[in-house]
Amino acid sequence: AESHWCYEVQAESSNYPCLVPVKWGGNCQKDRQSPINIVTTKAKVDKKLGRFFFSGYDKKQTWTVQNNGHSVMMLLENKASISGGGLPAPYQAKQLHLHWSDLPYKGSEHSLDGEHFAMEMHIVHEKEKGTSRNVKEAQDPEDEIAVLAFLVEAGTQVNEGFQPLVEALSNIPKPEMSTTMAESSLLDLLPKEEKLRHYFRYLGSLTTPTCDEKVVWTVFREPIQLHREQILAFSQKLYYDKEQTVSMKDNVRPLQQLGQRTVIKS
């Protein structure tokens, strides 16, 4: 049987054979991959990149959250959507997950001018069906998925909007465990609206296998701030394995080459 994919830290600290990022197969070896380092001064301003419109993001819900063995994931089940932001169509929210380390400078997947952040949050959306502009696009869409990526850094205050998620972590230490979060809205997790005006855009891939090259990425310039203990909770409460021997951390794919692609900014 083929080994399952994993992160470097899992291979280093476990006896189970698994495929580390450099050995991920299929699309993962292609040339339009994510994440990337964004050189902020090289990104050209594109006037078409306007503000986002968030639908259902403000609705308080009791979200299901699970440990999927690679990250912690909130199931969003089309209960919210986005449009605007230079996107070609509305996109339905599917799931939210995060990437992190146990140290401040290396938990994000994307970097800005070579700087990594403590964490990165991805809200994954799928393009609403029947909205592609032409047949070629519908068959081979490079923007079938829209990911909103938020960098996370440490601040001095507890971020109350994140508390329902942070408090749920204790209930899902092992892979395949799930729980229901205290009522919260997606908007609670986001920076204030005025901080969502500045973002970077490029075409790339999923950052986990199968690394499909069908993602339109939005990386917001302004980071979310969480308290130190909120950030550390992710690496302290969650495990990659059912035996709880390998702490879940460093679930970060190494940077990929930008190649011939361009990054634009709002």
């Epitope: 146990d102 400078y105 700087e115 850094e153 440490a154 001095t156 130190r228 690496s235 302290q236 460093d250």
Partner: antibody, heavy 119, light 107 residues
């Protein structure tokens, strides 16, 4: 009261290794990062690296990657730094410090360990 | 990595005078600068965090200001116990870096 107490001064031969300690008290050891800083005589402060005592995760200044190894023992609330292949350039005072926020200021410092490398 | 420049290298003052230390970053770092005092043969002691936030137990004569690239630490009435070297540290980017320090001495 938060306190970081470092091990005593050391005189060692070139080419050898040594391990210094930093014992923490007065707070939850695993909840704060421990940083290590080098100060050569009459010089400024140079950051060596950081350890998360809860997980053992480390991050080093590129300059010290092959020189320093950071570890921590949760049971005794003690952080350690081992320095290898010592030369006279390693003669310095070494401080441990607690990071007050995640990735920010150093709010409590040890008294320093003086290392002298000489034959 | 971000370079931190402190000036002047040495400041000579009389007791009771107001004194200011300057710290400049090679790129904008918001308010992620912290100030330390190190007396002879002692450990650094945190004086000011995030450019201007006071620290419990530090005398009120110490204050900080600035944002972006230019920062100032002020002592509004120098006392003899303030004789020390003063360092600033940026925590905006890894690796964290310190200035070379400003030595405060009495005239």
């Amino acid at each position: 009261d938060v306190q970081l107490v470092e091990s005593g001064a050391e005189l060692v031969r070139p080419g050898t290794s040594m391990k210094m300690s930093c014992k923490a008290s007065g707070y939850a050891f695993t909840n704060y990062l421990i940083e290590w800083i080098k100060q050569r005589p009459g010089q400024g402060l140079e950051w060596i690296g950081v350890i998360n005592p809860g997980s053992g995760g480390t991050h080093y200044n590129e300059k010290f990657k092959d020189k320093a190894t950071l570890t921590a023992d949760k049971s005794s609330s003690t952080a350690y730094m081992q320095l290898s292949s010592l030369t006279s350039d390693d003669s310095a005072v070494y401080f441990c410090a607690r990071e007050g926020d995640y990735g920010s200021r150093f709010d409590y410092w040890g008294q320093g360990t003086t290392l002298t490398v000489s034959s | 990595q971000i370079q931190i420049t402190q000036s002047p290298a040495i400041l000579s003052v009389s007791p009771g005078e107001r004194v200011s230390f300057s710290c400049r970053a090679s790129q904008s770092i918001g308010t992620r600068i912290h100030w330390y005092q190190q007396r002879t043969n002692g450990s650094p002691r945190l004086l000011i965090k995030y450019a201007s936030e006071s620290i419990s137990g530090i005398p009120s004569r110490f204050s900080g200001s600035g944002s972006g690239t230019d920062f100032t630490l002020s002592i509004n009435s120098v006392e003899s116990e303030d004789i020390a070297v003063y360092y600033c540290q940026q925590s905006n980017s890894w690796p964290t870096t310190f200035g070379a320090g400003t030595k405060l001495e009495l005239k």
